[in-house]
């Protein structure tokens, strides 16, 4: 083949499902509350995909804190099984791991990581900044925490369960009882409230997932995260979807689910694109 | 100078497949520093982005979902050229078609148009 | 799909007199190292568009600095300081924050 042909070989575009995910206090910053004590807590550090340290105040803060190290693991990471064991044993991979890694138009020469059938590895790439698709990572763990198989010809789904290739046994990591619900909105709808840098005092609206509602609260006018809303009703639209209730034998009920479904692709396309 | 040269029939039976050109000049359709995009325009659904090619590593495309299953856009590395291709077209696609360029580095836009194809979908 | 809306749809204005059109998204553009992923243009009559402003705020080469662009999330203003005759025109806002690319329905700017 010259090299004229395959230069022609044009990468397509493809349909995806919505990104499920599950915990949603895992996903909140460490939050140490309005007192003043020093008590030594654990939070989950959806960045570095780590248990870490914090102080925490004493009162309010999030779910996000645990009493030790061991819970905090116990809780957020993959090696505990607090998730869901799937019913089904197929391979877990989401369908955007076998997408081929899309630059986008823009060139911004940002470096992120995407999952590489060919090779099985999550490898880096350059990332122009605008669109693209959802095969693209802020880190390589987070990349390989999603796509990669596990170690000992396991497959680690997105759950924490794993998958034995050799003998298609599901394998859990903890006898603890599973979480009961799976979060489908977007994942920036599970982050806090993030006034970010600047002076201003914007009236602002996020979705506080603890208590599924949208609340007030005042913007510096920069920065911050996409949990930020100029009304009350596009807060709801965006975020209040809704949890997905889990039943024994995998059986699901379907508790609040307004969007239609392409809107909610668009929304977990963001995810994984944009969070710069 | 970035020039793009728009050539292609202006009517087009229904059913049939609208086939229109876009030639360049002073930058190159493999450019890694931009993306070649079809838009049309008519008096219902003002100015409508079709899809887009560009070149990285390798060539990608993006479609719009409601011409998806319709719509083909090449790139003519030897003649530095694009084109679009509309199958099954009917009268709803009678536009007019522009090419554009998506300026990928520090100004991310469409920043050179064609000169547009005004294409009537008639029998 | 994203859905741009833009007001006034039409602007009848006074030379050197200011312009303001407004450009409305129905999901926040978002913010990236700076970036809005925003675009405006203007379509002359008989002509192309031509892009004015980029990433939200930032006037393309030969824009005068009449133009500016601003805003963030949801809501964007082009403004025009002094309108000039040569400003009459159908103007446009365009995201690329997600597939598919889409344009608001257009300002028509003419003089009074």
């Known amino acids: 083949d010259s090299e004229e042909d395959e230069e022609h070989t044009i990468i397509t575009d493809t349909e995806l499902p919505p990104l499920k995910l599950m915990h949603s206090f895992c996903a909140f910053k460490a939050d140490d509350g309005p007192c003043k004590a020093i008590m030594k807590r654990f939070f989950f550090n959806i960045f570095t995909r780590q248990c870490e340290e914090f102080i925490y105040g004493g009162c309010e803060g999030n779910q996000n804190r645990f009493e030790s190290l061991e819970e905090c693991k116990k809780m957020c990471t993959r090696d505990n099984a607090n998730r869901i064991i799937k019913t089904t044993l197929q391979q877990e991979k989401p369908d955007f791991c076998f997408l081929e890694e899309d630059p986008g138009i823009c060139r911004g020469y940002i470096t992120r990581y995407f999952y590489n059938n060919q090779t099985k590895q999550c490898e880096r790439f350059k990332y122009g900044g605008c669109l693209g698709n959802m095969n693209n990572f802020e880190t390589l763990e987070e990349c390989k925490n999603i796509c990669e198989d596990g170690p000992n010809g396991f497959q680690v789904d997105n759950y924490g369960t794993q998958l034995n290739a050799v003998n298609n046994s599901l394998t859990p990591q903890s006898t603890k009882v599973p979480s009961l619900f799976e979060f489908h909105g977007p994942s920036w709808c599970l982050t806090p409230a993030d006034r970010g840098l600047c002076r201003a005092n914007e009236n602002r609206f996020y979705y506080n997932s603890v208590i599924g509602k949208c609340r007030p609260f005042k913007y510096s006018g920069c920065g911050g995260n996409e949990n930020n809303f100029t009304s009350k009703q596009e807060c709801l639209r965006a975020c209040k979807k809704g949890f997905i209730q889990r039943i024994s034998k995998g059986g699901l009920i379907k508790t609040k689910r307004k969007r239609k479904k392409q809107r909610v692709k668009i929304a977990y396309e963001e995810i994984f694109v944009k969070n710069m | 100078q970035v020039q793009l040269q728009q050539s292609g029939p202006g009517l087009v039976k229904p059913s049939q497949t609208l086939s229109l050109t876009c030639a360049i000049s002073g930058d190159s359709v493999s450019s890694d520093s931009a993306a070649w995009s079809w838009i049309r325009q008519s008096p219902g659904r003002g100015l409508e982005w079709l899809g887009i090619i560009y070149k990285r590593s390798k060539w990608y495309n993006r479609y719009a979902v409601s011409v998806k299953s319709r719509i083909t856009i090449n790139p003519d590395t030897s003649k530095n050229q694009f084109s679009l291709q509309l199958n099954s077209v009917t009268p709803e696609d009678t536009a007019v078609y522009y090419c554009?360029?998506?300026?990928?580095?520090?100004?991310?836009?469409?920043?050179?148009w064609g000169q547009g194809t005004l294409v009537t979908v008639s029998s | 799909d994203i859905v741009m809306t833009q007001s006034p749809l039409s602007l009848p204005v006074t030379p050197g007199e200011p312009a303001s059109i407004s450009c409305r998204s129905s999901?926040?553009?978002?913010?990236?190292?700076?970036?809005?992923?925003l675009n405006w243009y203007l379509q002359k009559p008989g002509q192309s568009p031509q892009l004015l402003i980029y990433k939200g705020s930032n006037r393309a080469s030969g824009v005068p600095d009449r133009f500016s662009g601003s805003g963030s999330g949801t809501d964007f203003t082009l403004k025009i300081s002094r309108v000039e005759a040569e400003d009459v025109g159908v103007y446009y806002c365009?995201?690329?924050?997600?597939?598919?690319?889409?344009f608001g329905q257009g300002t028509k700017v003419e003089i009074k």
């Open positions: 554009a360029r998506w300026h990928s580095d520090k100004m991310w836009g469409f920043d050179d």
């Open positions: 365009q995201q690329y924050d997600s597939y598919p690319l889409t």
């Open positions: 999901q926040s553009l978002v913010f990236s190292r700076g970036n809005t992923y």
